[in-house]
């Protein structure tokens, strides 16, 4: 039950995380115009991974796509790539995890197969979350660098009287959405990996083994180790695994001088 809950919760958390990563990637507010300590303008600028927008005080908003590919900064391209990889991996992970869910029956799928699929989707979610966090962090670092560079020469004098105000950009809402979403996807992935351990076939799940002695039989109840007297084949207290243990119907013991009551 706990395994199913962990797996289900991991799936839901990852689903929310990936939805968040998609939302962050599509959002226009990755960087927003810094309003602090800036001359008050009637225009507000903000930028996303795919386009930049300007909102006038009149309410009019105008967005322009980055129609060039080669002209864009390498860092922006890298962030785009990381976010897309994160989305793709997350989407595949979601698809795999749906079939891996314990509560969903698909034919006669073995628990071991479900465990492997759960682990696979968990790893995919972890990598997806890391990609998103990395992408957002790279962009944030880029913003911080540019912010201080533009602060250093915020007012570039032009012939004494005339001044040009440089627009500074700070963290936009998409960055926080991306960080949270990446974190959720990561947590969901970890939960899936934990659930995978519980889904794997139990190694301590044994069947009762009985031995037939001459005249009467002594049945041994399953317990981690077989009771040993120092005789027989299990002299070293080896663990009896499911694969090796055989049932009463399968094994017929023959009388021996070592039989005991």
């Amino acid at each position: 039950m706990a395994v199913t809950a962990c797996q289900g919760l991991g799936f839901v958390v990852s689903l929310i995380g990936i939805a968040g990563i998609i939302a962050a990637t599509c959002m226009d507010q990755w960087s927003t115009q810094d309003l602090y300590n800036n001359p008050v303008t009637a225009v507000f600028n903000y930028q996303g991974l795919w386009r930049s927008c300007v909102r006038e005080s009149s309410g009019f908003t105008e967005c322009r796509g980055y129609f060039t590919l080669l002209g864009l900064p390498a860092m922006l391209q890298a962030v785009r790539a990381l976010m897309i990889v994160g989305i793709v991996l997350g989407a595949i992970g979601l698809l795999v995890s749906i079939f891996a869910l314990k509560c969903i029956r698909i034919g006669s799928m073995e628990d071991s197969a479900k465990a492997n699929m759960t682990l696979t989707s968990g790893i995919m979610f972890i990598v997806s979350g890391l990609c998103a966090i990395a992408g957002v962090s790279v962009f944030a670092n880029m913003l911080v660098t540019n912010f201080w560079m533009s602060t250093a020469n915020m007012y570039t004098g032009m012939g004494g009287m005339v001044q040009t105000v440089q627009t500074r950009y700070t963290f936009g809402a998409a960055l926080f959405v991306g960080w949270v979403a990446g974190g959720l996807t990561l947590i969901g992935g970890v939960m899936m990996c934990i659930a995978c351990r519980g889904l794997a076939p139990e190694e301590t799940n044994y069947k009762a083994v009985s031995y037939h002695a001459s005249g009467h039989s002594v049945a041994y109840k399953p317990g981690g180790f077989k009771a040993s007297t120092g005789f027989g084949s299990n002299t070293k207290n080896k663990k009896i695994y499911d694969g090796g243990a055989r049932t009463e119907d399968e094994v017929q013991s023959y009388p021996s001088k070592h039989d005991y009551v």
Partner: antibody, heavy 119, light 113 residues
Framework: QVQLKESGPGLVAPSQSLSITCTVS????????VSWVRQPPGKGLEWLGV???????NYNSALMSRLRISKDNSKSQVFLKMNSLQTDDTARYYC?????????????WGQGTSVTVSS | DIVMTQSPSSLTVTAGEKVTMNCKSS????????????LSWYQQEPGQPPKLLIY???TRESGVPDRFTGSGSGTDFTLTISNIQAEDLALYFC?????????FGSGTKLEIK
């Protein structure tokens, strides 16, 4: 069609306050910003302040302490209240609408109301 | 506050001529986000309220004759009126629509001979 009409007292005594109402038609104040501009006789234009669609205001820094702009969307009215009037506040007061997608420019103006500050 | 300086303060021309008037701002009115200049031009005929001619420094308001052309970027702007007509007798103002407070130039008075 778009119309703006100012209505004011005409004559105001020095140190008194001025209240002007701008009644608009043909558009909604919940979608457009309205500015107040004045023009002293024979002089240029002076921007006083603006109230945007969302209700946020910006004022001329020189007049900020004695100026207040408000509006009533349901009545399609914008109000200008100015305190401590002096003789140099004598001017024609205009209200003007900020066009949408026109670079914050004022695309429609009222005819203005003349205000004389005199004892 | 942004200072808008207009020159000349007055112009006298004959009908059919071409005229240019200048406007200079103390800070750049160019917004880097959309590469637009937030400068407007207004025409005020005697006894009338101002009328919008040009916004974004070069975009003509609908209904404005194409004889009126706005140009310039950053801090230096120009309004050109070609083939001047008698009805163009008016005051022309430039306005900063980028920084608060919005400020107007002192105006250029256009007179017809």
């Amino acid at each position: 069609q778009v119309q703006l009409k100012e209505s004011g007292p005409g004559l105001v005594a020095p140190s008194q306050s001025l209240s002007i109402t701008c009644t608009v038609s043909g558009f909604s104040l919940s979608n457009y910003g309205v500015s107040w501009v004045r023009q002293p006789p024979g002089k240029g234009l002076e921007w006083l302040g603006v109230i945007w669609a969302g209700g946020n205001t910006n004022y001329n820094s020189a007049l900020m302490s004695r100026l207040r702009i408000s509006k009533d969307n349901s009545k399609s009215q914008v109000f200008l209240k100015m305190n401590s009037l002096q003789t140099d506040d004598t001017a024609r007061y205009y209200c003007a609408r900020h066009g949408y997608g026109k670079g914050n420019a004022m695309d429609n103006w009222g005819q203005g109301t003349s205000v004389t500050v005199s004892s | 506050d942004i200072v808008m300086t207009q020159s000349p303060s007055s112009l006298t021309v004959t009908a059919g001529e071409k005229v240019t008037m200048n406007c200079k701002s103390s800070q750049s009115l160019l917004n880097s986000g959309n590469q637009r200049n937030y400068l407007s031009w207004y025409q005020q005929e005697p006894g009338q309220p101002p009328k919008l001619l040009i916004y974004w420094a070069s975009t003509r308001e609908s209904g404005v004759p194409d004889r009126f052309t706005g140009s310039g970027s950053g801090t230096d702007f120009t309004l050109t009126i070609s083939n001047i007509q008698a009805e163009d007798l008016a005051l022309y103002f430039c306005q900063n629509a980028y920084f608060y407070p919005f400020t107007f130039g002192s105006g250029t008075k256009l007179e017809i001979k």
